[in-house]
Interface confidence: low
């Protein structure tokens, strides 16, 4: 970088090399070149020579002034015009950064995805800081008072093996960068209350061609949690509004849920579960598509992304699915 060059003088920034975005800043350049009384001092930002707001302070020093500096990063260097030199002589360079102090981290959330072996803690970091911001996640046992700290630049996965101080913890997050430090409120957690069951997956669907056609959705989870509550939402692909059905579930066998749907319409289904009475839900499962038959049953295979027809009495769908982006607000 620009900071690694051999200097024949000194460049510095006031109030600091890293400063709050929108501030007025001054960049000073002082030449110390043998046998050179600089005729002129020049400033370059990202390789482009600056023309305005340059003030000569004395024989060896000049100042460049910026009003309302808004660039997150810039490489600055300055040069001197020396008598008897055809080229400008490089004096020194510096990388400067502007940004914001961190906001107070909020919405601290910790969950354990079943079988993951980790407690995953996330938070809302607030507005973009533009500069290097680190987070320290503090985990303090309420039983043993042992405190562990984890440094990260985003979320953190904490091995459940390291959580040996009982099941009750306080978790809080400190955000820090060159411009400031903030600390979240403390979140009290009980490890048994933050487990999210192993993902529920819709495996297939079939429409039984009875007097009133009935669609059965087959779905399952590998969870070992005994009491699980689930929601299945569904809608016609042309609709905006979801219908939601709730289930108390025992995953000792594959679940079968029945729906009475309109004929000849493509529907989309998703499922999510939580441990009954707990706070956190799984994200919604992959989108599962199923088209109901007109009169002749059909098979829909998501694996091939097209509809095939079948002359049997039932219409079935299987799905490899794809991830939905509609997961906002599902955890919390």
């Amino acid at each position: 970088g620009i900071t690694n060059i051999n200097c024949s003088g000194h460049i510095w920034v006031e109030p600091a090399t890293i400063f709050k975005m929108g501030m007025n800043i001054s960049i000073y350049c002082q030449a110390a070149i043998k046998n050179c009384q600089p005729r002129k001092l020049h400033f370059y930002k990202n390789g482009i020579k600056e023309r305005f707001q340059i003030t000569r302070i004395n024989k060896t020093t000049a100042r460049l002034w910026y009003k309302n500096f808004l660039e997150p990063h810039a490489s600055m260097y300055c040069t001197a015009e020396c008598p008897k030199h055809f080229q400008e002589t490089l004096i020194c360079g510096k990388d400067i950064s502007s940004g914001y102090p961190p906001d107070i981290p909020d919405e601290v959330t910790c969950v354990i995805y079943e079988y993951s072996g980790n407690m995953t803690c996330t938070w809302n970091a607030g507005k973009l800081t533009y500069i290097d911001t680190k987070y320290v996640v503090h985990v303090k046992s309420l039983e043993t008072e042992e405190e562990q700290q984890y440094l990260t630049s985003s979320y953190i996965n904490i091995s459940t093996d390291s959580l040996q101080g009982g099941k009750k913890y306080l978790v809080w997050v400190q955000a820090a960068n060159a411009l400031g430090m903030e600390e979240s409120k403390q979140l009290q957690i009980h490890l048994d209350d933050i487990v999210i069951p192993s993902a529920a997956v819709i495996s297939r669907a079939e429409t039984i061609n009875a007097t009133v056609p009935k669609t059965i959705i087959y779905w399952d989870s590998q969870t070992t949690i005994e009491k699980v509550s689930c929601e299945m939402r569904y809608k016609a692909t042309t609709n905006q509004t979801w219908n939601v059905k709730e289930f108390d579930t025992n995953f000792t066998y594959v679940q079968q849920s029945e729906f009475y749907l309109e004929p000849n319409i493509k529907y989309v289904f998703q499922v999510r579960c939580q441990e009954t009475g707990k706070r956190y839900w799984q994200p919604w499962s992959s989108l599962f598509f199923h088209k109901t038959p007109e009169t002749v049953p059909q098979v829909t295979s998501k694996a091939f992304q097209h509809d095939t027809w079948n002359s049997g009495l039932t219409v079935a769908s299987i799905s490899t699915g794809h991830l939905t982006s509609d997961n906002r607000g599902d955890i919390g």
């Epitope: 039983e143 459940t160 093996d161 390291s162 040996q164 101080g165």
Partner: antibody
Framework: QIQLVQSGPELKKPGETVKISCKAS????????MQWVQKMPGKGFKWIGW????????KYTDDFKGRFAFSLETSASTAYLQISNLKSEDTATYFC????????????WGQGTLVTVSS | DIKMTQSPASLAVSLGQRATISCRAS??????????MHWYQQKPGQPPKLLIY???NLESGVPARFSGSGSGTDFTLNIHPVEEEDAATYYC?????????FGAGTKLELK
Amino acid sequence: QIQLVQSGPELKKPGETVKISCKASGYTFTTVGMQWVQKMPGKGFKWIGWINTHSGEPKYTDDFKGRFAFSLETSASTAYLQISNLKSEDTATYFCARSSALTGAFAYWGQGTLVTVSS
Amino acid sequence: DIKMTQSPASLAVSLGQRATISCRASKSVSTSDYSYMHWYQQKPGQPPKLLIYLASNLESGVPARFSGSGSGTDFTLNIHPVEEEDAATYYCQHSRELPRTFGAGTKLELK
């Protein structure tokens, strides 16, 4: 099944050092803290403290700070209690124990190691 | 530190009768969720054996004649009907905070 097997009895002179081992089996050693408990003859149990088997961080109760030290040999699933500068009042049976993270109850115990300090 | 006071220090009970052992904590060992009180049995030359955890939960493999009750500061271990193999010393222990402390023990003998 879960087992904690401790080293055999020790006879030491005052001022010497003793190191007791506790080998764990039947579970993943680094997932549960190891506790140490003292039982003096004719007296009750005193909790010495515990060591976090994942981070290696020891915690001692006030009565046992200084001469008592916990350590680990994770590759051998073994925890150690070392007592230095032994005194006659250290004569006791020392137990390692595995506590339940949820309850704090000592669900599994080693068989105990009798340390006798006598000149 | 929380001081655990057990009573009686010893008791003699006839086979088939009820044995009741009390343990009082110097301050509450209960939260809104649990009572962090546990009971152990120790026989000579053996390590302690967990009988009851969280005041009233029977540890796996422990006979149903052992039961625990109580909350806050006062807890009780009951054995009924007492059998010959129950002759031992019984200890209470809390895990509400650090340090974890034990009662002085109650020696149960058979008449």
